[in-house]
């Protein structure tokens, strides 16, 4: 169980002296910060009693484990039911208490009802202040029982709930008809999940045999222990004012734990700590009682004295809960009450005894909670005890429970059970989470959910190149911090597994899903420089570059141009994919433009240093394209040209270009200049024979325009094969603009 | 769903007797308080007789006392009232009701009659 | 024992009145009244309980109110289906009723 406890500080006579506090003995516990352990809550339940409201309670945390609630400011602020909830996960539990009015109608005799599943359960309310009304039963808030106030029994109203299963748990009331509630008589039923003695799923365990009032847990079999009560039976009694699993915590004040209720886990509920008993716990036990409640009774034989907070003092020569055994009858000793083990490992599991005779190695033996027994290997003798020593099999996870200790000789028997714990070592249920990756190295989040049990002692970080069959490398960390993974190799995928360990021998967990996590490329260091750029037309520009000679491959996938229009600030980015293009035509520009042009090489994602920029100017955009664009064969070497002038002109028209290629013909076009803008007609010399031409033209005014329609035509035949196409006579002294 | 079904009215002569059922469903009978309440014909409605739910306590108008027995079979989910030296005055449509009470434990408790039968009509007359 | 008076006897309204219904009660009952609906040949509804709490399933244009003596039950815009008798009934001591209340079409 959880070691959890809620104090209760019932020294009523002025309520903003009351207090609550939790304490939690767990590891971690109310830290909050760390991912493997949440915080301590401490709070009041307004569900079921509702309060009018008043100032808001004080939660001050004090320390890690410790949490107090005050500020109560009058007495019906008490009233009702508080809440502390510690333990992480699974173990995550919720300790109740509740606060009963002094000042009440109705008072229960018992607070806290912890009974069986079948169980006949009787809730029992003393009247207090007597009323002539019915008297209402209620169950967590609702409507439940009624009684005629004539049915009272020696001053008592008693609910009766026969055969109690686990859902009649809850919080009961009995209220007069027509008074506050607040004057309410309030219960607490804990009905455990099994028959009295029985634990597990469907039951089939059997408990420890709790001692001193200690209540077995319907889940784990564990003895939830009073206040001031030990070990795995509870056998053992703590130091007056102590309490705690463990002992460890100390009741507050010089009266020690007097006037403090101590709530524990379910199904152990409430009661005042060992010594204590009362309404407000502030009653030492009667001479022969001792205990939690002072609900146990010494019945100490052989001269034992009775002590409220432990129980029978021995005289020397005898032990035993009423001192009914002789020491020369064998004991087992110094036996832990818990031990813990991981699943499939080979303990060894000691074992000493004393007595009179000599225990030997075949009086001890060790059996298991399927009844079976070992034999110890070895006995190491010494002159106070013998120590026997067991080789555990191989642990499965049905060997979790009771184990007992048993020692036999002439003179008696001694038994001592203890707990065994097969925990499961944890397995990841997801793969590590990439945070951020370089060229070299990957950073890596190691912190996931598993299966099995913690805590996680240390988490190992596997990893090789995928598809390798090279062997994994490890490194260790801290479970709470990212990991960086150095040295890598650029451009890699690597598998990464997570590997959890908890404490122990054979903690280690088993591997858990690989991840795929990639390296980033090395960054390009070349740096381009631009050769040159030629205008090709208003929109169109042809730009060129070198990259610096280095030995070895080149390190990059492509290039990035980028032209900046500073004027509209927009940029343009154009991607050139192959490493080894040293050119490229930028098209779709806009005309007219002042541009900066740099170049910069690209590996993966990276971009190199870029080249030193370039600025480049545009010509503006030329007119609209020349209509009705008509082509006709004069000769066999002739093609007249007739078209008309484009319209809505921007300017003057400085010239027109004419483009002449051969249908079907592989090679460059011919661009020739008409220099006379007026024309509207001229003649194309110098054309082959028999040859099916294409024409189109554009006119210039600061720049080019668009081109007209392509119109097609074909010289007659017969003619000689001429040297080439010209315009009119002056074709040769202007030669040809390609 | 709550259900309360009367049975067991009819004609009968003056200084007769008559027993009334009321079988109840859909909750915790046992854990009840019930109730008769009649309705003289055009007139008011008239507590008759409670019994708490152990069957240990009853309570009757005086109009009624010494005549009329009220009683339950938590086992049978059943109310009954015996009607013993019937008069003309008794002649009504007899009710059984549960007694409800207000929920949360915030809340004052006070008691009502939260569902009724349809009712059976008893007709005393010679 | 506790006597319930109610006022008035009867009385005629029509559909989308304000209606108010009043209850005395002989001695001090703190909260603890109810109100009842019920229609001719029909078993009675609870309503209200104590003094102003609505039930579920209850029209919010019915409300109650008073506390002591001296009690009201009031329908803020009477409906088609609200004809009918209404009675109020102490819880406070041995359960009585009023004598009812009829509201009849107008």
């Known amino acids: 169980a959880v070691d959890l406890t809620l104090l209760a500080n019932l020294r009523l006579t002025d309520p903003q002296r009351f207090f609550l506090t939790c304490v939690s003995g767990e590891a971690g516990a109310g830290r909050g910060s760390d991912a493997w352990g949440p915080p301590l809550l401490l709070e009041k339940d307004d569900r079921i009693v509702r309060t009018p409201p008043g100032p808001p309670l004080r939660l001050a945390r004090n320390g890690s484990h410790q949490v107090t609630l005050r500020g109560f400011s009058k007495p019906s602020d008490l009233v009702g039911v508080f809440s502390c909830v510690g333990g992480a996960g699974a173990r995550r539990t919720r300790v109740i208490y509740v606060h009963n009015s002094p000042g009440a109608h109705l008072l229960p005799d018992k607070v806290t009802h912890t009974v069986n599943k079948g169980d006949t359960a009787v809730l029992s309310a003393r009247v207090h202040k007597e009323k002539q009304t019915d008297v209402i039963w209620k169950s967590n808030g609702s409507y439940f029982y009624t009684l005629d106030w004539h049915e009272a029994q020696d001053g008592r109203f008693l609910l009766q709930l026969p055969n109690v299963q686990p859902p009649s748990s809850g919080i009961y009331s009995a209220t007069y008809l027509e008074a506050s509630p607040l004057g309410s008589a309030f219960f607490r039923l804990i009905v455990r999940g099994c028959g009295a003695g029985r634990w597990g799923p469907g039951c089939t365990k059997e408990c420890p045999g709790c001692l001193h009032g200690g209540v077995c847990h319907d889940h784990d079999g564990e003895c939830v222990c009073p206040p001031g009560f030990t070990g795995t039976r509870c056998e053992q009694a703590c130091r007056e004012g102590r309490f705690g699993q463990s002992c460890q915590e100390q009741c507050p004040g010089i009266s020690g734990c007097r006037g403090l209720t101590f709530c524990l886990p379910d199904p152990y509920g409430c009661s005042c700590g060992s010594g204590w008993r009362g309404s407000q716990c502030q009653e030492a036990c009667a001479p022969g009682h001792f205990g939690a409640d002072c609900r146990l009774q010494c019945q100490c034989q052989n001269g034992g004295t009775c002590d409220r907070f432990s129980g029978c003092v021995c005289p020397s020569g005898w032990h035993g809960v009423h001192c009914e055994k002789s020491d020369r009858i064998p004991q087992i000793l110094n036996m832990a009450s818990e031990l813990e083990f991981n699943l499939e490992t080979m303990p060894r599991i000691n074992c000493a005894a004393a007595g009179n005779p000599f225990p030997v190695r075949g009086s001890i033996e060790l059996r298991k909670p399927d009844g079976t027994v070992l034999l110890s290997t070895k006995a190491i003798v010494e002159p106070e005890k013998t120590t026997a020593e067991f080789e555990v099999p191989r642990l499965v996870l049905a060997d979790s429970g009771f184990w007992e200790c048993r020692v036999s000789t002439s003179g008696g028997q001694d038994s001592r059970r203890f707990k065994v714990n097969v925990k499961v070592p944890p397995v990841p249920l997801a793969a590590p989470r990439l945070l951020t990756k370089q060229s070299r190295q990957l950073v890596v989040s190691p912190l996931v959910s598993f299966s099995g049990d913690g805590p996680i002692s240390t988490v190992r970080l596997h990893y090789r190149p995928q598809d390798s069959t090279m062997d994994w490398s490890t490194i260790v960390v801290d479970p709470s911090e990212n990991v960086t993974l150095m040295n890598l190799r650029p451009k890699t995928g690597y598998s990464v597994r997570v590997q959890l360990s908890r404490p122990g021998e054979g903690g280690e967990g088993a591997w858990g899903p690989p991840t795929l996590m990639t390296t980033d490329c090395p960054e390009p260091l070349l740096q381009p420089w631009l050769e040159g750029w030629h205008v090709e037309g208003t929109d169109r520009l042809r730009v060129s570059w070198s990259l610096p000679l280095v030995p070895g491959p080149l390190v990059g996938d492509g290039f990035l141009l980028r032209l900046w229009d500073g004027t509209r600030g927009q940029e343009r980015r154009e991607n050139v994919s192959s490493p080894q293009a040293r050119t490229a035509l930028l098209t779709g520009l806009t005309p007219g433009t002042h541009y900066q042009l740099d170049v910069q090489l690209y590996h993966c994602t990276l971009l190199g240093p870029a080249s030193p920029p370039a600025h480049v100017l545009l010509p503006p955009s030329g007119p609209p394209a020349p209509r009705h664009l008509h082509a006709q064969a004069l000769s066999d070497s002739e093609i007249q040209l007739t078209w008309k002038h484009p319209e809505a002109l921007p300017g003057p028209i400085s010239k027109y270009v004419v483009e002449v290629q051969v249908a079907g013909g592989a090679g460059d076009p011919l661009w020739i200049d008409v220099d006379r803008p007026e024309e509207t007609s001229t003649i194309i010399r110098g054309l082959n024979a028999s040859t099916r031409y294409l024409f189109r033209m554009r006119a210039s005014i600061q720049g080019l325009g668009d081109w007209s329609n392509t119109v097609e035509e074909s010289t007659l035949g017969n003619g000689l094969q001429a040297e080439g196409p010209v315009q009119e006579s002056r074709a040769a002294e202007e030669g040809l603009d390609q | 769903e709550v259900q309360l079904l009367e049975s067991g009215g009819g004609l009968v002569q003056p200084g007769g007797s008559l027993r009334l059922s009321c079988a109840a469903s859909?909750?915790?009978?046992?854990?009840?308080?019930m109730l008769w309440v009649r309705q003289a014909p055009g007139k008011g409605l008239e507590w008759v007789s409670s019994?708490?739910?152990?069957?240990?306590?009853?309570y009757y108008a005086d109009s009624v006392k010494g005549r009329f027995t009220i009683s339950r079979d938590n086992s049978k989910n059943t109310l009954y009232l015996q009607m013993n030296s019937l008069r003309a005055e008794d002649t009504a449509v007899y009710y059984c009701?549960?007694?409800?009470?207000?929920?949360?434990?915030?809340?004052?408790?006070?008691?009502?009659?939260?569902?009724w039968g349809q009712g059976t009509l008893v007709t005393v007359s010679s | 024992d506790i006597q319930m008076t109610q006022s008035p006897s009867s009385l005629s309204a029509s559909v989308g009145d304000r209606v108010t219904i009043t209850c005395r009660a002989s001695?001090?009952?703190?909260?603890?009244l109810n109100w009842y609906q019920q229609k001719p040949g029909k078993a009675p509804k609870l309503l209200i309980s104590?003094?102003?709490t609505l039930q579920s399933g209850v029209p919010s244009r019915f409300s109650g109110s008073g506390s002591g003596t001296d009690f009201t039950l009031t329908i803020s815009s009477l409906q088609p289906e609200d004809f009918a008798t209404y009675y109020c009934?102490?819880?406070?001591?041995?359960?009585?009723f009023g004598q009812g209340t009829k509201v009849e079409i107008k």
């Open positions: 009701a549960r007694v409800g009470y207000s929920s949360g434990w915030y809340a004052l408790t006070s008691k009502t009659f939260d569902y």
């Open positions: 859909g909750f915790t009978f046992s854990h009840y308080q």
């Open positions: 019994i708490y739910p152990s069957g240990g306590w009853t």
């Open positions: 001695q001090t009952i703190s909260s603890y």
């Open positions: 104590a003094a102003s």
């Open positions: 009934q102490q819880s406070y001591s041995t359960p009585s």
